[in-house]
């Protein structure tokens, strides 16, 4: 009685259960009553990452330097190449097919999370007591200067974009 379903890592063809090819190998010929499935290793620039019956291996991803990409992890016969972005750039999408420059946080905003090769800068508004007067991809909101610790008084209140201005205390005679 020919099978209608096959075990894990097998496939059904011509009423036969044939072994799938292991990751890193492609199908050359299906099994028959007289022969096993024939598989061949993927070539240097190719891969297959699952048990499969593919007759062609997939081409490794190309990390195009013209798109700001570089190799983070070289592909093997079983894994694809992983690309990442050059310094100062991050992936435009999850598939990381091209890169864009990290954005800067404008004055009044500080860096909450510095950008990586795969994620953009995350900015946050400077809360009360903090400021940022620069457009930067690295600078966090800085605390206002504490005039008291310098034995000075606030002459001009700080904002989210400016520090407080300290001045000398008025001396009463």
């Amino acid at each position: 009685e020919p099978p209608t379903a096959c075990r894990e890592k097998q496939y059904l063809i011509n009423s036969q259960c044939c072994s799938l090819c292991q990751p890193g190998q492609k199908l050359v010929s299906d099994c028959t009553e007289f022969t096993e499935t024939e598989c061949l290793p993927c070539s240097e620039s190719e891969f297959l990452d699952t048990w499969n019956r593919e007759t062609r291996c997939h081409q490794h991803k190309y990390c195009d330097p013209n798109l700001g990409l570089r190799v983070q992890q070289k592909g093997t016969s079983e894994t694809d190449t992983i690309c990442t972005c050059e310094e100062g750039l991050h992936c435009m999408s999850e598939s990381c097919e091209s890169c864009v420059p990290h954005r800067s946080c404008l004055p009044g905003f500080g860096v909450k999370q510095i950008a990586t090769g795969v994620s953009d800068t995350i900015c946050e508004p400077c809360p009360v007591g903090f400021f940022s007067n620069v457009s930067s991809a690295f600078e966090k909101c800085r605390p206002w200067t504490s005039c008291e610790t310098k034995d000075l008084v606030v002459q001009q209140a700080g904002t989210n974009k400016t520090d407080v201005v300290c001045g000398p205390q008025d001396r009463q005679r």
């Epitope: 010929s29 028959t32 022969t35």
Partner: antibody
């Protein structure tokens, strides 16, 4: 029905080459390996090699590897076995087979 | 290479009586996938070999059910439950689990 029809008998001189053909019909040639087997007069069967017509993949018996070449022409559903540098001991009937179906055999005589 | 040893070399039989042929391999012929490609062929006088049994126990289509195959590892047997006159010829076992594939030396079955 499945049929494997082989080329006719050959008489060759030592040192020459012979090319035996095997025409398949009644099935898709590219789905089964073609096996080549020979049988010297009054002797048993000897496996020479196999070829998969779909991929061109081959398996050879080391004993013949340097002298035998297996090929296929899928456009005419024909497999070939070429044996070079013939010697008298190569006198035999040469069979192509799908294992479940066999050709009628080709007699190759090597004689000076 | 795997050596396939058949016994007996010659088997005189009486029609209607059972017959048994043994085939021993020099090493285990279970392949890496867990399959055993052990086949039995009959070569009738003046004919090409014909497949009887494949993968140790499977009878090829059209083969009478008086033929059966059994065994595992290194020991295999072909049984004919009731021999008929048309069963005469040379029987060969063949292993295609490990390259180079090899035939047994043959067992000649003849009527007493």
């Amino acid at each position: 029905q499945v049929q494997l029809v082989q080329s006719g008998a050959e008489v060759k001189k030592p040192g020459a080459s012979v090319k035996v053909s095997c025409k398949a019909s009644g099935y898709i040639l590219t789905t089964y390996w073609i096996t080549w087997v020979r049988q010297a007069p009054g002797q048993g069967l000897e496996w020479m090699g196999d070829i998969h017509p779909g991929s061109g993949s081959t398996k050879y018996n080391e004993k013949f590897k340097s002298r035998v070449t297996l090929t296929v022409d899928t456009s005419i559903s024909t497999a070939y076995m070429e044996l070079s540098r013939l010697r008298s001991e190569d006198t035999a009937v040469y069979y192509c087979a799908r294992r479940d179906y066999w050709g009628q055999g080709t007699t190759v005589t090597v004689s000076s | 290479d795997i050596v396939m040893t058949q016994s007996p070399l010659s088997l005189p039989v009486t029609p209607g009586e059972p017959a048994s042929i043994s085939c021993r391999s020099s090493q285990n012929i279970v392949n890496s996938q867990g399959n055993t490609y052990l086949e039995w062929y009959l070569q009738k006088p003046g004919q090409s070999p014909q497949l009887l049994i494949y993968k140790v126990t499977n009878r090829f289509s059209g083969v009478p059910d008086r033929f059966s195959g059994s065994g595992s590892g290194t020991d295999f047997t072909l049984k004919i439950s009731r021999v008929e006159a048309e069963d005469v010829g040379v029987y060969y076992c063949f292993q295609a689990s490990l390259v180079p594939w090899t035939f047994g030396g043959g067992t000649k079955v003849e009527i007493k």
